[in-house]
């Protein structure tokens, strides 16, 4: 073509795959009449006529572009729709008059690759490999042109390094003309790379400029020999009986060796294997003082045929023994004195406290409690608490009952009970003393006795309310070797309709309908008089 050598560089038109390329014929009016133009595509230096413009009217030539070309901008621009990678070529327009001139356009096509897909080598890498081993593979699909790949380790780009880092990239052309890039990172890794984060980055161009896409970060399994095994105990700090204690074996190698945990038998000094759970953890629950001792872990690395032993670990499960109180069952006369002594063993220093059982009041800090000039009220429960102050929750207790000799002592002297005739009444009477009294009733009925504590007894009587009973009332008598005492229950008839809810004169009332021989549970609904009770 005359004058082709001195032709300027073609105009660059950049478009993304799938969009429309606007090819504007840049011939000036002096160079040619735009109403009479031929358009060619140039591929491998071969020109193919693809479109004709005559008197401003366009006509596609048969072939690959037939359906995708149209004229725009009053005939000066050729629009190519649905651009594909195969469209990346030179297009030229040639004016026919006054003389043949042409204008060249270089069409550049771009397509962003998909998100890079990274796959780590699932088999892992030994640290002492002689040459770089496959770490991960990065695949970037359907990009155009071929994107560039950069590999990163812990955020830093990796460069080719002889015998250390090798990046092997290859690409395939899809039927669409798009490229799929595959890049394999091979590297020699060290133990410190066990936590290293690797990712790949695809760099590509679009008409809008340079862009990049990053893969997710991955870590590769790194295998390195075990050099040390050790024991770890949880929880850390002071252990006590009842705790859940976990003893686990750990190693600095990957994969870890096969572990066994053993405890030294103090008498034979032999290591005896302890049964671990599926995770190789020895669980002591609840921990007992017998679990104290010397533990060690053996790791068998069958890959290198090396057995490794941990440093032994002394485990101390702190305890407090059963608490002993002497005297164990003290009996004293009123006015006398009593010394209670508390003893216990522990793996740590103990603190003792004496408390009154009924009130929880602290009476003494120390193992000895002295009681002088004993009154009847001093009888009852005393609790010794032996505790280890340095280990919260580690304590044992013992209750001792102090008995003061004396005749029966009644819970009340007199009581009024409101009743209905023919109802079955449930009456109760309580007495205390040492020796423990027994209770008898002055009327026939079903009586049952219940020991409340070593000095106290409760008797209940089921009796039918009769006119005679209303007249005489009911007496309960408590007696022991040292005497007897009586309580009286006065029975009074009540009219349910006249009874006011705030009446304070009733002492025992059944709200169930009282029909002949109906059993009424008077104890559950009993309302006590506010009057002070005399105590025999």
């Amino acid at each position: 073509v005359p004058g082709e050598a001195e032709q300027p560089a073609p105009e660059l038109v950049e478009v993304e795959v799938g969009s429309t390329a606007l090819l504007k014929c840049g011939l000036s009016q002096s160079q040619g009449n735009l109403s009479h133009v031929d358009w060619f595509s140039v591929h491998k230096e071969k020109r193919t006529l693809i479109f004709r413009v005559r008197q401003g009217q366009g006509q596609s030539e048969p072939g690959e572009y037939e359906q995708r070309l149209s004229l725009q901008d009053r005939g000066a621009t050729l629009a190519l729709t649905q651009v594909t990678p195969q469209d990346e070529r030179i297009f030229l327009c040639q004016g026919k008059r006054p003389r043949s001139q042409e204008y060249r356009i270089q069409l550049r096509v771009y397509k962003a690759p998909e998100e890079p897909n990274i796959q780590v080598n699932p088999l892992g890498i030994p640290v002492n490999s002689k040459e770089p081993e496959e770490v991960a593979t990065c695949v970037g699909r359907n990009g155009y042109p071929i994107p560039q790949v950069i590999w990163y380790k812990n955020g830093r780009p990796l460069k080719e390094e002889k015998n250390r880092v090798h990046i092997q990239s290859s690409q395939t052309v899809e039927s669409s003309g798009l490229y799929t890039l595959q890049s394999i990172l091979k590297a020699q890794l060290v133990k410190e790379d066990k936590d290293a984060q690797f990712y790949c980055e695809l760099n590509y161009r679009l008409p809008s400029g340079n862009h990049m896409k990053e893969s997710r970060e991955v870590t590769v399994p790194v295998f390195y020999p075990t050099e040390k095994v050790w024991l770890e105990v949880e929880p850390v700090g002071m252990l006590k009986e009842g705790d859940r204690v976990e003893i686990r074996c750990l190693a600095d190698g990957n994969p870890p060796p096969h572990f066994s945990i053993s405890k030294q038998n103090p008498s034979t000094r032999e290591a005896e294997e302890e049964t671990t759970n599926d995770n190789g953890v020895l669980v002591l629950e609840p921990a007992r003082k017998e679990h104290s001792g010397r533990y060690e872990c053996q790791g068998l690395d069958l890959d290198t045929m090396i057995s490794l032993l941990s440093e032994p670990q002394e485990l101390l499960v702190n305890y407090v023994s059963d608490v002993r109180v002497s005297p164990a069952a003290p009996e004293r006369q009123e006015g006398s004195s009593l010394t209670l002594t508390c003893e216990a063993e522990s793996s740590q220093d103990l603190e003792f406290q004496w408390l009154r059982e009924e009130t929880g009041q602290v009476l003494e800090r120390g193992p000895v409690l002295q009681l002088h000039d004993l009154k009847r009220e001093a009888g009852g429960g005393y609790r010794c608490v032996a505790s280890v102050p340095s280990i919260p929750g580690l304590n044992r207790t013992q209750l001792v009952n102090v008995a003061i000799f004396g005749p029966p002592w009644m819970a009340f002297k007199e009581r009024k009970v409101w009743v209905k005739e023919n109802m079955v009444l449930n009456l109760s009477c309580e007495a205390s003393g040492h020796p423990r009294p027994t209770i008898s009733w002055n009327v026939n009925g079903t009586a049952s006795e219940q020991d409340q504590d070593p000095q106290r007894v409760l008797s209940t009587l089921n009796v039918l309310v009769t006119p005679e009973l209303l007249e005489t009332g009911v007496e309960c008598t408590a007696s022991n070797d040292l005497g007897k005492n009586t309580s009286i229950l006065f029975l009074e008839l009540v009219n349910l309709t006249t009874l006011t809810p705030d009446s304070n004169t009733t002492t025992g009332l059944s709200t169930s309908t009282a029909s002949p021989h109906t059993r009424a549970n008077s104890t559950s609904t009993e309302r006590k008089l506010p009057e002070p009770e005399s105590r025999g």
Partner: antibody, heavy 117, light 112 residues
């Protein structure tokens, strides 16, 4: 017949390195661990380290870590031990041995290494 | 580290005699899960490489004459040669593999 054939005696200068080889025959090389042992003149035996020819994993006596490097070439059924920064203390006979049940059932004939200026 | 102590350091016996040599470890070599003692005995004849005689404290290696017997457990082990032969002249080493590998100092057996 199972054999472990080691290289001949070595005379090396202080500070230099030496690489001893141990060629295995008569059994599947990758099925057994290879161990290395040092015997100083008139002295007892000292374990240096082990290597698994199949996985390439190795383990060392901490005393020899950094002094000895164990490698294998599966294609030639050969185990290697490189000793570096040699001093007169490293003068000894070095043995390779095949591992079985945490014992050493076959031994090479030994390689004498003399470090002298 | 586990220390292996062998005694006596040397002994001289006549052919046909019974001989015992002792090996003590600074801690038990009995693996609690396998119930095996991680101890082996080796024989090293003058100018030769060591040879495995006994492993797991009492298992005789194939091809080893039955006059060689290993016994013991935990920390105390014994190698017994029931009737010493002239070819038994050697240094005998015990070795533990319970925690890495360590050899004893050896017992030198001489024939009178």
């Amino acid at each position: 017949e199972i054999q472990l054939q080691q290289t001949g005696p070595e005379l090396v200068k202080p500070g230099a390195s030496v690489k001893i080889s141990c060629k295995a025959s008569g059994y599947s090389f990758t099925d057994y661990i290879m161990l290395w042992v040092k015997q100083s003149h008139g002295k007892s035996l000292e374990w240096i380290g082990n290597i698994n020819p199949y996985s390439g994993s190795s383990g060392y006596n901490l005393k020899f870590k950094g002094k000895a490097t164990l490698t294998v070439d599966k294609s030639s059924s050969t185990a290697y031990m490189q000793l570096n920064s040699l001093t007169s203390e490293d003068s000894a006979v070095y043995y390779c041995a095949r591992g079985k049940d945490f014992a050493m059932d076959y031994w090479g004939q030994g390689t004498s290494v003399t470090v002298s200026s | 580290d586990i220390v292996m102590s062998q005694s006596p350091s040397s002994l001289a016996v006549s052919a046909g005699e019974k001989v015992t040599m002792s090996c003590k470890s600074s801690q038990s070599l009995l693996n609690s899960s396998t119930r095996k003692n991680f101890l082996a005995w080796y024989q090293q004849k003058p100018g030769q490489s060591p040879k495995l005689l006994i492993y797991w404290a009492s298992t005789r290696e194939s091809g080893v004459p039955d006059r060689f017997t290993g016994s013991g457990s935990g920390t105390d082990f014994t190698l017994t040669i029931s009737s010493v032969q002239a070819e038994d002249l050697a240094v005998y080493y015990c070795k533990q593999s319970y925690n890495r590998y360590t050899f004893g100092g050896g017992t030198k057996l001489e024939i009178k």
